[in-house]
């Protein structure tokens, strides 16, 4: 019986962008300004998200879809659907509770967000440092000694590598 009733429910005919108005004999009424319904058969419309403060509007709210926000310059999105904005830092820095701080020696961050990560350790793969690391860039490892030996093939597969610190030679 319940199933039959739901099939005959007049609200199921209300399309996205409308709601089934109980106060008006269950007729389909358009969503009021600043609200939306993204699916049919809704008994209410949802309030549109408002992009205020550090949030800015990436996509306006319509009767069938919610507004989408991103962050003002100097901030970046965090969380699903950009639920938070976090302050950018410079490359070579990370955000702490006390603000942006330079990466410690031996670490780097090549982005405006995220944390400082340790330089690759070239010596773990038996390699030397080709280019030193900086606060903004990881170390670049050179080829392994085996790649440099007289019998090394002229076509070597991609040579992994890894080490912080000083220059080879």
């Amino acid at each position: 019986f319940e199933r039959t009733r739901s099939l005959q429910d007049p609200c199921s005919n209300c399309p996205a962008g409308t709601f089934c108005d109980n106060n008006r004999n269950q007729i389909c009424s358009p969503c009021p300004p600043n609200s939306f319904s993204s699916a049919g058969g809704q008994r209410t419309c949802d309030i549109c998200r408002q992009c205020k403060g550090v949030f800015r509007t990436r996509k306006e709210c319509s009767s069938t879809s919610n507004a989408e926000c991103d962050c003002t310059p100097g901030f970046h999105c965090l969380g699903a659907g950009c639920s938070m904005c976090e302050q950018d830092c410079k490359q070579g820095q990370e955000l702490t509770k006390k603000g942006c701080k330079d990466c410690c020696f031996g670490t780097f961050n090549d982005q405006k967000r995220g944390i400082c990560r340790p330089w690759t350790n070239c010596s773990l793969d038996g390699k030397s440092v080709l280019v030193n690391g900086t606060k903004e860039r990881d170390v670049v490892c050179g080829p392994s000694p085996a790649d440099l030996s007289p019998g090394a093939s002229s076509v070597t597969p991609p040579a992994p590598a890894r080490e912080p610190g000083h220059s080879p030679q």
């Epitope: 050179g142 040579a159 890894r162």
Partner: nanobody, 115 residues
């Protein structure tokens, strides 16, 4: 993956010049450090010069003041300008592209300095 192809090698007289090119496939090449190595018969490959993604350069003592490494990121190419060449510069010259712990070799180009 980035692939590297060297060119510009050849036979040159002592005191002459050559310019080697290392051309790369792949638009991320600009983020790679690139080095030139060379290998004479029966000897290990030795580092000649390296240029970082930012353009910082470093040279082996044996080529300082004679060789210049440079890069043109718009052309995805790194160059090695070799002046005042000596017979001891004779070798196969290899390009090595590296980023963090990854590296790729080219196939090499022969440079012979002889009168």
């Amino acid at each position: 993956a980035v692939q590297l192809v060297e060119s510009g090698g050849g036979l040159v007289q002592p005191g002459g010049s050559l310019r080697l090119s290392c051309a790369a496939s792949g638009s991320i090449f600009s983020s790679y450090a690139v080095a030139w190595y060379r290998q004479a018969p029966g000897k290990p490959r030795e580092l000649v010069a390296v240029i970082s993604s930012e353009g910082t350069t470093r040279y082996a003592d044996s080529v300082k003041g004679r060789f210049t490494i440079s890069r043109d990121n718009a052309k995805n190419t790194v160059y090695l300008q070799m002046n005042s060449l000596k017979p001891e510069d004779t070798a196969v010259y290899y390009c090595f592209g590296g980023r963090s712990s990854m590296g790729t070799w080219g196939q090499g180009t022969q440079v012979t300095v002889s009168s």
